[in-house]
Amino acid sequence: QKSSIEKCSVDIQQSRNKTTERPGLLNCPIYWQQLREKCLLFSHTVNPWNNSLADCSTKESSLLLIRDKDELIHTQNLIRDKAILFWIGLNFSLSEKNWKWINGSFLNSNDLEIRGDAKENSCISISQTSVYSEYCSTEIRWICQKELTPVRNKVYPDS
Amino acid sequence: QKSSIEKCSVDIQQSRNKTTERPGLLNCPIYWQQLREKCLLFSHTVNPWNNSLADCSTKESSLLLIRDKDELIHTQNLIRDKAILFWIGLNFSLSEKNWKWINGSFLNSNDLEIRGDAKENSCISISQTSVYSEYCSTEIRWICQKELTPVRNKVYPDS
């Protein structure tokens, strides 16, 4: 027997405005930096890639997804120390023998010039100047992203 | 030399209101279900645990984190079919030989009674009635969560 709270929950908010616009961030939270239409969080602590992915997720954000070379350069310009590496949301898919973004898309070979091997347990990091393949177990910093503006029709239905 | 856009970005929005309240969802997106102060997304499709984590992340949400037995029971009450399993944000940390939530905390042994082995490549799923350890590579459904209300002082400093 479901309690009234579950009954309310199962009804997928029929009474609310069924707009497909989700609230979205109007400005970036403290400690996050705005870069165009994104908010970026550059970690100070270090983690393996998997933990970095999980950390961004628990912050209701994503490991950084980079659309093109231009966005890469602008992101790298925000890195203040040449020696620091940051995980982004790209790793090697062994089954598909290709670099794969965490949103399921594959790397366009023109987008990033990767230094290092494309092999099992390889994940991608960026520095102020370069893009590197590293063992995913390496503990380095990472970059989370949130979309800044309300996104129309980015519905996120049920999964 | 930084362009004006980067200068603006590096300045972490000094001019904006420095509240530690981030916008938060005021109501749940379409297809998501409200359960207390969370929006839950019960997937219909299936994925390995890692892909489920990534999917929630790209939705700027998290695989489900369960605080206590009470929240587990209320979540299970929303599952409509006894035979369906859903990934949550808990897996086995080989290095720490313990169940670990994706937010970095360890499972309190009193919270969930897990059926199955605690070993490498084990991830946690829930059904309408139980909590199971499964191979993380198994393709099952998953549950994403978003916090519903604005959360004061949840600052997300650097990580």
Epitope: G104, V155 | V46, N47, T58
Partner: antibody
Framework: EVQLLESGGGLVQPGGSLRLSCAAS????????MSWVRQAPGKGLEWVSA????????YYADSVKGRFTISRDNSKNTLYLQMNSLRAEDTAVYYC??????????????WGRGTLVTVSS | DIQLTQSPSSVSASVGDRVTITCRAS??????LAWYQQKPGKAPKLLIY???SLQSGVPSRFSGSGSGTDFTLTINSLQPEDFATYYC?????????FGGGTKVEIK
């Protein structure tokens, strides 16, 4: 441009085989479960098969179970339908379709133009 | 399998009319219903999902309602481009099923 493009249809004799392909572009193909839907001449829509984003889980309509096999190659952004033991009642336009959200099977917001399969002696 | 029964199977209407199509599910499907429009020789087009949510780019004269087993698609002020066949589809459980279709014809 966001699109799906089917190919591989044609005329085949009963008992024969065909392999349909669907090339995806403009979206993150590997994030989505995908389906095949068919439409017999002058008839309604019938869901045929679905495959999970990672490709490890497949489902079929009873009418094609054991004869059709759905598969995908995420590195090539391509969906396939291998059709064996074809029957006259399999004659239809076959569409590949993408769901609105990565965690949905249905609510198809993107369809291909379709490819016609004719099973006749 | 969940059966979806659409009615009417066809309707004759004029430009400016209000048209209502219903879809009944053989068992409860919560709000997991979508509506599609299909024109001859073309692929279907998603109009409404989650029973009442309007898909991006679809004119606001289209609306959906209902929950459980009974659902409705309404076209307010029918336009010339709206003459087509409309299908409902449930996404509650596999196999995905479609209604038999409703043809909206010019009176």
């Amino acid at each position: 441009e966001v699109q799906l493009l089917e190919s591989g249809g044609g005329l085949v004799q009963p008992g024969g085989s065909l392999r349909l392909s669907c090339a995806a572009s403009g979206f993150t193909f590997g994030q989505y479960a995908m389906s095949w839907v068919r439409q017999a001449p002058g008839k309604g829509l019938e869901w045929v098969s679905a495959i999970s984003a990672a490709g490890g889980t497949t489902y079929y309509a009873d009418s094609v179970k054991g004869r059709f096999t759905i598969s995908r190659d995420n590195s090539k952004n391509t969906l396939y339908l291998q059709m064996n033991s074809l029957r006259a009642e399999d004659t239809a336009v076959y569409y590949c379709a993408k769901p609105l959200d990565s965690s949905q099977w249905a609510d198809f917001d993107l369809w291909g133009r379709g490819t016609l399969v004719t099973v006749s002696s | 399998d969940i059966q979806l029964t659409q009615s009417p199977s066809s309707v004759s209407a004029s430009v400016g009319d209000r048209v209502t199509i219903t879809c009944r599910a053989s068992q409860g499907i919560s709000s997991w219903l979508a509506w599609y429009q299909q024109k001859p020789g073309k692929a279907p087009k998603l109009l409404i999902y989650a029973a009442s949510s309007l898909q991006s780019g679809v004119p606001s004269r289209f609306s959906g309602s209902g929950s459980g087993t009974d659902f409705t698609l309404t076209i307010n002020s029918l336009q010339p481009e709206d003459f087509a066949t409309y299908y409902c589809q449930q996404a509650w459980v596999l196999p995905i099923t479609f209604g038999g279709g409703t043809k909206v014809e010019i009176k």
